[in-house]
Amino acid sequence: QAVPPYASENQTCRDQEKEYYEPQHRICCSRCPPGTYVSAKCSRIRDTVCATCAENSYNEHWNYLTICQLCRPCDPVMGLEEIAPCTSKRKTQCRCQPGMFCAAWALECTHCELLSDCPPGTEAELKDEVGKGNNHCVPCKAGHFQNTSSPSARCQPHTRCENQGLVEAAPGTAQSDTTCKNPLEPLPPEMSGTMLM
């Protein structure tokens, strides 16, 4: 089995990931591994010479680039935050800041926007990946409530008055908790919607 550089008449190389066709000499040469770049091009008698990317630069894939890409920080103005640093083998890893979702995508997220509020009685449907899309609000399931307008508030189970030695004065709704009262006291009209102890 030939090792690079080797002649190729059909302009293809055996290992497409780690080799490339060099048209000038009609040969297959080695690509440089991630974290490196081509410091000397191949010839008929000498394979590609690779060198390590300098600090603050990277190449993610097997390549025949003569330079490394410059590391760039995530752009906080675009609502992005950093989850992992740039290394010689990978670019800076970014994601939307908490409370935001990706609004513009070009190979990777370029711009995040604030998540929409979910109104009382609803909560944001849980997604597989945080920050991938805007909120889709779904009603609280039976026996639960949510009483704010918020992008992140979760529906909570209604209070069970009997667990506190109290009795139910008013049932809970999707937007409000159960109202409890002391079993010995009648509920004054002005106190409806609150819990009396």
């Epitope: 920080p73 906080p76 989850i83 290394t87 010689s88 083998k89």
Partner: antibody, heavy 116, light 107 residues
């Protein structure tokens, strides 16, 4: 050559704040992340956060969020780390460090003692 | 957060000995691990980055290996100046985390 020179030792009372400086030289200050790491006596090294002086954006370890503020002054190539609401557990050596696949460059460290 | 569990916490060895220190990450960190040497009253010094790459000026007796979750620092023949504390660190994801150190003492 790359140098990071930190301010001198500090003694503080619980509840006070401390601000430690880190003056960088020998490289382009705005294009490298500067981190802060602390080492309490007999404890593990703890990463606190970083600043990217190019856009003066900082990111913090959740553990210190709300208490730590990292800033940078491009005109003097100096980074600052301010820690507020100090408690005795904050007694430590605080280091600034420049990152690239680890921390190849460190300041000499600043001892902060919190005692009533 | 990713935990870096380093072992042993201390060891006694003689000049010329081969010393091995291990570090286990609580989740996959690829090869994004660094090793440091620290002497009392001094800042840590970078020895190894990317799990196995010796930093410039570091003697060849220091070597690193591993990927994923298991990493090793080896000193092939311990020298008098190597008695110090050694730390591992992951820089795969924030927050960066460190092992709690291995103190290498003279037997």
């Amino acid at each position: 050559q790359v140098q990071l020179v930190q301010s001198g030792a500090e003694v503080k009372k619980p509840g006070e704040s401390v601000k430690v400086s880190c003056k960088a030289s020998g490289y382009t200050f705005t294009t490298y992340y500067l981190h802060w790491v602390r080492q309490a006596p007999g404890q593990c090294l703890e990463w606190m956060g970083w600043i990217y002086p190019g856009n003066v954006h900082a990111q913090y370890n959740e553990k210190f969020k709300g208490r730590v503020t990292i800033t940078a002054d491009k005109s003097t190539s100096t980074a600052y780390m301010e820690l507020s609401s100090l408690r005795s557990e904050d007694t430590a050596v605080y280091y600034c460090a420049r990152s690239w696949e680890g921390f190849p460059y460190w300041g000499q460290g600043t001892t902060v003692t919190v005692s009533s | 957060d990713i935990q870096m569990t380093q072992s042993p916490s201390s060891l006694s060895a003689s000049v010329g000995d081969r010393v091995t220190i291990t570090c286990k990450a609580s989740q996959n960190v690829g090869i994004n691990v660094a090793w440091y040497q620290q002497k009392p009253g001094k800042a840590p010094k970078l020895l190894i980055s990317s799990a196995s790459y010796r930093y410039s000026g570091v003697p060849s007796r220091f070597s690193g290996s591993g990927s994923g979750t298991d990493f090793t620092l080896t000193i092939s023949s311990l020298q008098p100046e190597d008695f110090a504390t050694y730390f591992c660190q992951q820089y795969d994801t924030y927050p960066f985390t460190f092992g709690c150190g291995t103190k290498v003492e003279i037997k």
